[in-house]
């Protein structure tokens, strides 16, 4: 079951999944000037059995001018260096979730991938939060959120984390110093790398879009 919403937003914090549950989808998005190859995969899918999980499908991008030409999926070393990483080395990670059965690791980058990844999480997915650079964590509890199914609807639990700009205040015992945001973003751009939604193509979906005249201006 896919989660209906994004994980909660915490001011001055970003979130990251350390591993992805089977059923998670990752959009095949390309950076500007590049597009998904003709009839190429729309998404990567975490699949597997009890002993091994991996990402099905490959994302491939091609120059908009030559869309029917397939590009290599493995980035060159210099491209990997330039690309914003989605990894988050975090002291908040209690276990190596990537080694858990039924989970996939972060997929490797593909050539000309968009700078932000759009994930579609499933029920049971856990994401971890940490404060962006310049902010320190005040923990009231776990700095994590889990997508849960309640009464037939999905919801994310609220992470117990506050990020404060008071760098001088003493740290909690055993608390590590705050680390840089994985994106190195200024605090004015604390939107997260990963977003979620129901990705399936369907013609009869529980979505509504109401178009209306919002305001009328006479000029």
């Amino acid at each position: 079951e896919l989660c209906d919403d994004d994980p909660p937003e915490i001011p001055h914090a970003t979130f990251k999944a350390m591993a992805y549950k089977e059923g998670t989808m990752l959009n095949c998005e390309c950076k500007r000037g590049f597009r998904r190859i003709k009839s190429g995969s729309l998404y990567m899918l975490c699949t597997g059995n009890s002993s091994h999980s991996s990402w099905d499908n490959q994302c491939q991008c091609t120059s908009s001018a030559t869309r029917n030409t397939t590009k290599q999926v493995t980035p060159q070393p210099e491209e990997q260096k330039e690309r914003k990483t989605t990894e988050m080395q975090s002291p908040m990670q209690p276990v190596d979730q990537a080694s858990l059965p039924g989970h996939c690791r972060e997929p490797p980058p593909w050539e000309n991938e968009a700078t932000e990844r759009i994930y579609h999480f499933v029920v049971g997915q856990m994401v971890y939060y940490q404060c962006v650079q310049g902010y320190r964590a005040l923990h009231r509890g776990p700095a994590e959120s889990v997508c849960k199914m309640t009464h037939g609807k999905t919801r994310w639990t609220q992470p117990q984390l506050i990020c404060t700009g008071e760098m001088e205040t003493s740290q909690f015992p055993g608390e590590e110093k705050p680390q840089a945001s994985p994106e190195g973003r200024p605090e004015s751009e604390t939107s997260c790398l990963v977003t979620t939604t129901d990705f399936q193509i369907q013609t009869e979906m529980a979505a509504t879009m109401e178009t209306s005249i919002f305001t009328t201006e006479y000029q």
Epitope: C28, C30, S39, A65, N68, T195, T203, M205
Partner: antibody, heavy 108, light 107 residues
Framework: PGRSLRLSCAAS????????MHWVRQAPGKGLEWVAV????????YYADSVKGRFTISRDNSKNTLYLQMNSLRAEDTAVYYC??????????????WGQGTLVTVSS | YVLTQPPSVSVAPGQTARITCGGN??????VHWYQQKPGQAPVLVVY???DRPSGIPERFSGSNSGNTATLTISRVEAGDEADYYC???????????FGGGTKLTVL
Amino acid sequence: PGRSLRLSCAASGFTFSSYAMHWVRQAPGKGLEWVAVISYDGSNKYYADSVKGRFTISRDNSKNTLYLQMNSLRAEDTAVYYCARDLLGSGYDIIDYWGQGTLVTVSS
Amino acid sequence: YVLTQPPSVSVAPGQTARITCGGNNIGSKSVHWYQQKPGQAPVLVVYDDSDRPSGIPERFSGSNSGNTATLTISRVEAGDEADYYCQVWDSSSDHVVFGGGTKLTVL
């Protein structure tokens, strides 16, 4: 003619902020005409030549709402306007879900 | 970029309907097809030339090569009567382009 109008599209049932969104219109008795598209985060916008410079597409992800600001309206802008969802966040390829549409009539 | 569709196609129930969409080297582009019944919003029936969304019957299929894309509806039913539109993304202009539409009449 010459006046302005703002359309809004309230989306629900999916994570609005993950999808590119389109406006497509259909004049009475005519075919579909694409108007504009905006990427999931609002960073990229593209317009049909017929509306470029007059219409502006925008979105408020915190309100799950898509907008179309229409200025300098002409009689030929009379149509049913559909709000529609793209399959990807910035793919602009496949329109997989459409709103029910709203009729805009421009007349003197 | 221009997509050309025949204005109308007629077919008897149970027969096969083929609706074409012509465009310069359209085979190099991904083509998507929409069905629109009177008074309703369009519905995606085929994407990426030949893939079907969930909920769309197997009777709907597509192909695309050269300068022509084709939507094929086998074992046509009365409920298939509608307007059908092809669509592509034109990378040279950064525009979505629709064909003019084809009215399918089930005799």
